[in-house]
């Protein structure tokens, strides 16, 4: 039997043991989150698989993920949404020590897909473990990119109260209009539900005492948000390591002064 021709993409292939990983993560998540115990993980996997299997991986749509999104419906309490841009690790470290706040990856669907890659092939039931489309070199409508665009949109749409966003103050563009936050989440916050967006600009340098809230890209973000009738606030976090320590234990003597 001749080996069937397989499309070669520029990106890395599906993460090994992808189906097992998704299923195992789903089981683990629903075990520790009572509000999601009703979720049937096999159905979740079937819906996930159904979004990309047998489909041309450069022609995936948000509609393909709707059955999965429906199964993973989850609400975040008002004032507890934490968005992030280019600073994922610190955002996740923060929600580990301040467990009442939620990033997208603390929600079921984000948790399932975090750091994974996947794609299928047109007209076969196989998963492509060799290569998957790269967003820049191949196409933007690939399974992974469309997934994150879909769930990011939904996460932003359902946010309420004061929404927080962690931004990387070490980048040339602290706010980047082309990031998922800048291109999707900002535009899907609902003014009738969201009172304000509070940006936390995380400083990289230990001796960096500049007010990065005055950065032109932050002013651009403020303008976009204000035009959407959402109030905007910005705060500098000069020492992220110290910040995490003090979030964990605010009564520590070194945290009681206004450092």
């Amino acid at each position: 039997v001749l080996p069937r021709w397989r499309q070669q993409w520029s990106g890395s292939g599906t993460t090994s043991r992808f189906p097992e990983t998704v299923l195992a993560r789903c089981v683990k998540y629903t075990e520790v989150h009572p509000e999601m115990r009703h979720v049937d993980c096999q159905s979740v996997w079937d819906a996930f698989k159904g979004a990309f299997i047998s489909k041309y991986p450069c022609n995936i749509t948000e509609e393909d993920y709707q059955p999965l999104v429906k199964l993973g419906t989850q609400t975040v309490p008002c004032n507890k949404t934490l968005l992030w841009s280019r600073i994922k690790d610190l955002a996740h470290q923060f929600t580990q020590v301040q467990r009442d706040m939620f990033t997208l990856e603390d929600m079921l669907l984000g948790y399932l897909a975090d750091d994974l890659t996947w794609c299928g092939e047109f007209n076969t039931f196989e998963i492509n473990y060799q290569s998957c489309p790269d967003w820049r070199k191949d196409c933007s409508n690939n399974p992974v990119s469309v997934f994150w665009k879909t769930v990011s949109r939904r996460f932003a749409e359902t946010a309420c109260g004061v929404v927080h966003v962690m931004l990387n103050g070490s980048r040339s563009k602290i706010f980047d209009k082309n990031s998922t936050f800048g291109s999707v989440e900002v535009h899907n916050l609902q003014p009738e539900k969201v009172q304000a967006l509070e940006a936390w600009v995380i400083h990289g340098g230990r001796e960096d005492s500049r007010d990065l809230c005055q950065d032109p890209t932050i002013k651009e973000l403020e303008s976009i948000i204000s035009k959407r009738n959402i109030r905007f606030f910005c705060k500098n976090i000069y020492r992220p390591d110290k910040f995490l320590q003090c979030v964990k234990n605010p009564e520590d003597s070194s945290c009681l002064s206004g450092i």
């Epitope: 309490p77 009442d100 110290k242 605010p250």
Partner: antibody, heavy 127, light 108 residues
């Protein structure tokens, strides 16, 4: 010194009404989320109601929903609970408590605890 | 609405270490706090955020959390520790406080 002082307790007949007050001292009352907790004679603590710092969000225990109303007057640093249609089982010492919140490097965080309690005021519902 | 279950009573002798447990259907994201109520007084916060001690609370008191259970340990037991101890958690999804039934600590 951070302090909470309750008042307004007393004897009331079943079906009657009473309003309890709690005044805060020594902290920025406007910033504080507040709660009412009660304790029936010889029993444990039971949460009654909770109110956000500006009074825009209120939450109630099922046992008092529709009968009790929590409110606040930030200009007077005072928390209230209006208790209507009182029943014998509402007899208790009523405590007001401040929700523990801290500013960590200008970021305000909720620590899900009640860090300051009043001395309590006794409500007796009896005919 | 979840219910927190505490052992009704525990006892110990001065200098001993006692542990009070609190179990229930916690969401992983809900924090546990502990309160001490001395006879005839208002409750006092002992532990917040599962294992953190407010300033002024002696380090003889410690909290821990493992999944669906939390516990309060008191080491070097003293006669003035005789009191009722309550665990509590704010349910961030239901927006309600849930208290345990309380544990009476007797120092023999």
């Amino acid at each position: 010194e951070v302090q909470l002082l309750e008042s307004g307790g007393g004897l009331v007949q079943p079906g009657g009404s009473l309003r309890l007050s709690c005044t805060g001292f020594g902290f920025t009352f406007t910033d504080a989320r507040m709660s009412w907790v009660r304790q029936a004679p010889g029993k444990g603590l039971e949460w009654v109601a909770d109110i956000s710092s500006y009074g825009d969000n209120t939450y109630y225990a099922d046992s008092v929903k529709g009968r009790f109303t929590i409110s606040r007057d930030n200009s007077a640093n005072t928390l209230y609970v209006q208790m209507n249609s009182l029943r014998a089982e509402d007899t208790a010492v009523y405590y007001c408590a401040k929700r523990m919140e801290r500013e960590v490097m200008t970021i305000k965080l909720d620590y899900h605890a009640m860090d300051v309690w009043g001395q309590g005021t006794t409500v007796t519902v009896s005919s | 609405q979840s219910v927190l279950t505490q052992t009704p009573s525990v006892s110990g002798t001065p200098g001993q270490r006692v542990t009070i447990s609190c179990s229930g259907v916690f969401n992983i994201r809900n924090y546990v706090s502990w309160y001490q109520q001395l006879p005839g007084t208002a409750p006092k916060l002992l532990i917040f955020k599962d294992d953190q001690r407010p300033s002024g609370v002696p380090d003889r008191f410690s909290g821990s959390r493992s999944g669906t259970s939390a516990s309060l340990a008191i080491s070097g037991l003293q006669s003035e520790d005789e009191a009722d101890y309550y665990c509590a958690a704010w349910d961030i999804f239901l927006n309600v406080w849930v208290f345990g039934g309380g544990t009476k600590l007797t120092v023999l």
